[in-house]
Structures are given as C-alpha cells and as structure tokens.
Interface confidence: low
C-alpha cells in the first residue's frame, strides 16, 4: 500500500460538507495523541470520511452521547 | 455545486514556462489530495503529480520530475501546477481532479471532481 | 512502475450488448484500482472505485470485479450513452498509471 495514505492519525483533515442525513454510522476513535477523531460512513456512496468535530450538529450528537452515558 | 474551474492554459515556446490554475468550489478544498493528469492529442490519460492536503507530501511522473511543481493555497481554495523547461512532448490538454482516499490507508476512491481542462501547446 | 494494459484496445458494439473490459496489471495492486469513462472533448468520469465500488450516481449496468492483477469492467447491457473510451488506474503505488484505454464503438 502506498506509504503516502498512512497517517499517524487516523484524521488529520477533516471533512465540513457533511449533512447529518448522508450519514449511515459513526466512529468515535479514541487514537492517543491524536485531536478527537470522528469516521462517518456515509450513505450514499458508503465511503469513509473524517468529519470536522465543530460542525454543529456533529456537536449536538456527542454532547446527547455523553448525556445519555452520564444518566446510566 | 462541487466543481474546479481551470485557467493559465496556452501557447509557449520550448524551454518557457506556464503556471496552471485550478480553483474549488463547493467542498472543503483544504481536506483533500489533488490530481494533475493529462491527455496528448489523441492519446490516453496520464497521471501527472498529486499532492496531499497540507502540501507535506507531493509524487509525480518521473517525465516531469525537475521540472514540474504541484503546490496549493488553501486559502484560495486553488491548485497550480508550475511548468518550466517545457518540451513539444508535454503539449496535451491538463486536468486537475479531486483525488479521493479515506481516513484509513487502504481507502482508494479514485478521481470523482474534474475540472474541464486546459490545453497546454509547446511549439516554436 | 507499474504497467496496465487494456484489453481489448477497441470493440464494437451494439446498443443491448453485454460488453466486456478487461484490465491486467504488472504487479498485484489488491482492490486499488478506479475505472472512468470519457468521451470526446470531455473530462472523465468516475465510474467505478476500489475494483468493484459503483460510484454514485452512476447506473447499475456498469459493474466492477477483480483483485490482484485481473480486473474487469462489465456493461450488463450497453446503451447509445455508453460509447466511449474506458480507462483503468491503479493506486496502489505511484506513479498512478492508467491503462491505455478501450474505445467502445456503435457497430
């Protein structure tokens, strides 16, 4: 595989052209060292893309993620 | 709508110099790799040089090696490619595109974003 | 580098057809391979990514198979929009080389 994909972190660009309803699922990775690194799958090519964390709605969902945690 | 929209193509004499442009719109430019290919008259597509978001990293065919350089301003949200030392084999029609890889290194998506091309002619 | 060559260079074809592409690299390159189309004066597009990924937007009778060395690019069932010329390129290693493409002609 070319070298030049890998990347010490899983994100180091960050996609904000993301609409909350193209996506299928999301992936939180808690990389060490590494900014808050969010994968979506979207749904309508199935690619990967790293999200942009301050997106608004992408904000909205952690902060209800972590809500719901807390209540537990 | 996502699209690029080049300029800077022309006429120019063995030897000289040409600077493409290609300019984003539509998508968050400074996330992604970027392509130059490019097509002789009646010939196939032949990538040229890419580079990723940040400029870090830049590849390119060995036949231009020296003498091209892929650089961005994301900024901008523009892509140039310089060309010097140009030779009668490099007249073709350029293109820039969006080159597509995944977070992880194995995700290869290939070229989805083109622009419409510009036609480079080097001739005495 | 890793060559890529097309076969066949040109076909024939008419409008219904099932058309076959055929892509054969030098060296194994996994799935890392994308397929365009281009017609005359136009830019290519996308049609297939990661061997065997439709892209979107693009119709169901184009289809993508193969891994390794051996890649095929099939049209279930060709129409009139569907003359032109299909390129192959791998990513797996730079430089990113096409193969030479395959022009499919109206019979």
């Known amino acids: 595989k070319p070298v030049s994909l890998s990347y010490r972190c899983p994100c180091r660009f960050f996609e904000s052209h993301v609409a909350r309803a193209n996506v299928k699922h999301l992936k939180i990775l808690n990389t060490p060292n590494c900014a808050l690194q969010i994968v979506a799958r979207l749904k309508n090519n199935n690619r990967q893309v790293c999200i942009d964390p301050k997106l608004k709605w992408i904000q909205e969902y952690l902060e209800k993620a972590l809500n719901k945690r807390f209540k537990m | 709508q996502v699209q690029l929209v080049q300029s800077g193509g022309g006429l120019v004499q063995p030897g000289g110099s040409l600077r493409l442009s290609c300019a984003a719109s539509g998508f968050t430019f400074s996330s992604y790799w970027m392509s130059w290919v490019r097509q002789a008259p009646g010939k196939g597509l032949e990538w040229v040089a890419n580079m990723n978001q940040d400029g870090s990293e830049k590849y390119y065919v060995d036949s231009v090696k020296g003498r091209f350089t892929i650089s961005r301003d994301n900024a901008k949200n523009s892509l140039y490619l310089q060309m010097n030392s140009l030779r009668a084999e490099d007249t073709a029609v350029y293109y820039c595109?969006?080159?597509?890889?995944?977070?992880?290194?194995?995700?290869?998506?290939?070229?989805?974003?083109w622009g419409q091309g510009t036609t480079v002619t080097v001739s005495s | 580098d890793i060559q890529m060559i097309q076969s066949p260079s040109s076909l024939s074809a008419s409008v219904g057809d099932r058309v076959t592409i055929t892509c054969r690299a030098s060296q194994g390159i996994s799935s890392a391979l994308a397929w365009y189309q281009q017609k005359p004066g136009k830019a290519p597009k996308l049609l297939i990514y990661?061997?065997?990924s439709l892209e979107s937007g693009v119709p169901s009778r184009f289809s993508g198979s193969g891994s390794g060395t051996d890649f095929t690019l099939t049209i279930s069932s060709l129409q009139p929009e569907d003359f032109a010329t299909y390129y192959c390129q791998q990513f797996n290693s730079y430089p990113r080389t096409f193969g030479q493409g395959t022009k499919v002609e109206i019979k």
């Open positions: 595109a969006r080159d597509l890889t995944g977070p992880y290194y194995y995700d290869y998506y290939g070229m989805d974003v």
């Open positions: 990661d061997a065997s």
